[in-house]
């Protein structure tokens, strides 16, 4: 009679993380009588995974059933699979005794766990930043195995790239993290703007997880200001609009000022808001310049989402106050940007609330 | 270490039955089948019956077929022989034994139950 | 079924000597490259101890005094040198198809 030997026909097996792992093993003889056990890696610290003899073992159902005569398939299957139970697994034949004795191991079968990578999550800046600051975004994906990935940055559908990318640890592990931090130039039309990471690996099959974020959270679009005089609405009144375009977010209160004291406060409501989700909003301020002696100077100061205001001013010259309704005024418009901001035609108002 | 502890001695009447148990312990119950031997007094073997604990499956010696009965209980790991419509001549030392490797063997023994067939 | 006969009923051998017990089976008792044929040892009091399997194959912790040989239907069990506790009755049993005993051969010191 030939020497009984331990056959492990696969060499290596790679199974879906929550899926069931055979794992193959046949013995070539029925001597010496004695249990098989399976166990996890090689040497004292080797890791029992299944004993014929005794011990519960709930994940482990053998294959073939070990009882009936002449039964000479111990594979088994482990169920459940997750990356902690990668490894190489090893069917031994013991020889029956007090106690039982190793008598001879399989070559060994490595068990690999593919497991898919979480959701990527983007997140961006603590802070919002102005159109031509460069913000960063990371992305972060866990629990993949093997460890090749590949990690792409979009914006817009435009590919990014300008990013740096960690897959951790570095050495041989049971499931990988990536890290990934991308720089992304923000401009005016970004409101509407997504960053996308996007992680493909042999997990899904081609069809790549995406994170995104939505530049609407990070960017900050300063308004411009211009206060204009609209004609006479009636005798001896002037009425000063303020308009605060293409500002973003929302968050924005407006204080008016004659000569330095605050004639009154609001806060942004109907606003309208513009193609590239901007808003336009209007404010304005009837004066009645026969209550002036002086000149007068009417500033509109805007705070937009908690930054330092910014304001315009316009010059009303009080002097003399014509009695027909209608003509024109001795106030003259002398207004000055004090923010140094540009204005430029709003041409893409959706429509226009006047708001007072 | 393998462990089969049967049940004490049982004196019966003719035409009774008795069931006797072997708790097993040392080894996976479910994994390695039961046999049942019986010695009369100053003879040789008698092969009944054995069961496989994991599914029940049984094979009985024809002149027991009739009579004996083998059962498992997995959850307390024992084992039952019941033997009805009993003789004297079935006054006996009754072993159950283990069979380790599967090859329809004795491996391991329980000590006996001794029963005593008598009017 | 099968029968099992062995011979001699009864021996008895010197200490140191060797003792032969045979078992001759009414058909083979060979299948699948193995002989299914077991020998057991029984001494008094005591329930029965496998000491060879297989046909040839010492069981764990037999002395090696003890070999078994044969194939088919005829089979041997030896003790090369008899020892005082070998004093027993040895029964041969196969599982070829159910188990079956032989009815047994008692050993004694002569």
């Known amino acids: 009679e030939e020497e009984l030997q331990v056959i492990q026909p696969d060499k290596s097996v790679s199974v879906a993380a929550g899926e069931s792992a055979i794992l193959h093993c046949t013995v070539t003889s029925l001597i010496p009588v004695g249990p098989i056990q399976w166990f996890r890696g090689a040497g004292p610290a080797r890791e029992l995974i299944y004993n014929q003899k005794e011990g519960h073992f709930p994940r482990v159902t053998t294959v073939s059933e070990s009882t009936k005569r002449e039964n000479m398939d111990f594979s088994i299957s482990i169920s459940n699979i997750t990356p902690a139970d990668a490894g190489t697994y090893y069917c031994v034949k013991f020889r029956k005794g007090s106690p039982d004795t190793e008598f001879k191991s399989g070559a060994g079968t490595e068990l690999s766990v593919r497991a898919k990578p979480s959701a990527p999550v983007v997140s961006g800046p603590a802070a919002r930043a102005t159109p031509q600051h460069t913000v960063s975004f990371t992305c972060e994906s866990h629990g993949f195995s093997p460890r090749d990935i590949t990690l792409k940055w979009f914006k817009n559908g435009n590919e990014l790239s300008d990013f740096q990318t960690n897959v951790d640890p570095v050495g041989e592990s049971v499931s990988y993290s990536i890290h990934s931090t991308a720089k992304v130039v923000l401009t005016r039309e970004d409101v509407h703007s997504q960053v996308i990471c996007e992680v493909a690996h042999v997990t899904l099959q081609g069809d790549p997880l995406r994170g995104t974020a939505n530049l609407s959270e990070t960017i900050r679009v300063p308004p411009t200001l211009e206060v204009t005089q609209q004609p006479v609405r009636a005798e001896n009144q002037v009425n000063v609009t303020c308009q605060v375009r293409k500002f973003y977010p929302q968050r924005l209160q407006l204080t008016w000022l004659e000569n330095g004291n605050v004639s009154r406060t609001e806060t942004a409501s109907t606003v309208t808001e513009n193609k590239d989700g901007t808003y336009n909003w209007m404010s304005w301020l009837l004066v009645n310049v026969s209550a002036h002696r002086d000149d007068v100077k009417l500033t509109c100061q805007v705070e937009h989402d908690g930054q330092p205001a910014v304001s315009k001013s316009h010059d009303l010259k009080v002097s003399a106050h014509p009695k027909e309704q209608g003509s024109n005024t001795a106030a003259e418009n002398t207004g000055s940007n004090e923010r140094g901001s540009s204005d430029y035609k709003d041409d893409d108002d959706k429509h226009h609330h006047h708001h007072h | 270490q393998v462990q089969l502890v049967q049940s004490g001695a049982e004196v019966k009447k003719p035409g009774a039955s008795v069931k006797v148990s072997c708790k097993a312990s040392g080894y996976t119950f479910t994994n390695y089948w039961i046999n049942w031997v019986r010695q009369a007094p100053g003879q040789g073997l008698e092969w009944i019956a054995m069961?496989?604990?994991?599914?029940?499956?049984?094979h009985y010696n024809q002149i027991f077929k009739d009579r004996a009965t083998l059962t498992t209980d997995t959850s307390t790991s024992t084992a039952y022989m019941e033997l009805r419509s009993l003789r004297s001549d079935d006054t006996a030392v009754y072993y159950c034994?283990?069979?380790?490797?599967?090859?329809?063997?004795?491996?391991?023994w329980g000590r006996g139950t001794l029963v005593t067939v008598s009017s | 079924d099968i029968v099992l006969t062995q011979s001699p009923d009864s021996l008895a051998v010197s200490l140191g000597e060797r003792a032969t017990i045979n078992c001759r089976a009414s058909k083979s008792v060979g299948s699948s490259g193995y002989n299914w044929l077991f020998w057991y040892q029984q001494k008094p009091g005591q329930p029965p101890k496998l000491l060879i399997y297989?046909?040839?194959n010492r069981d764990s912790g037999v002395p090696d005094r003890f070999s078994g040989s044969g194939s088919g239907t005829d089979f041997t069990l030896t003790i090369s040198s008899l020892q005082a506790e070998d004093v027993a009755v040895y029964y041969c049993?196969?599982?070829?198809?159910?188990?079956?005993f032989g009815q047994g051969t008692k050993l004694e010191i002569k």
């Open positions: 034994a283990m069979d380790y490797g599967s090859l329809y063997a004795m491996d391991y």
């Open positions: 049993q196969h599982s070829r198809e159910l188990p079956t």
């Open positions: 069961i496989d604990p994991s599914d029940s499956e049984t």
């Open positions: 297989l046909a040839s």
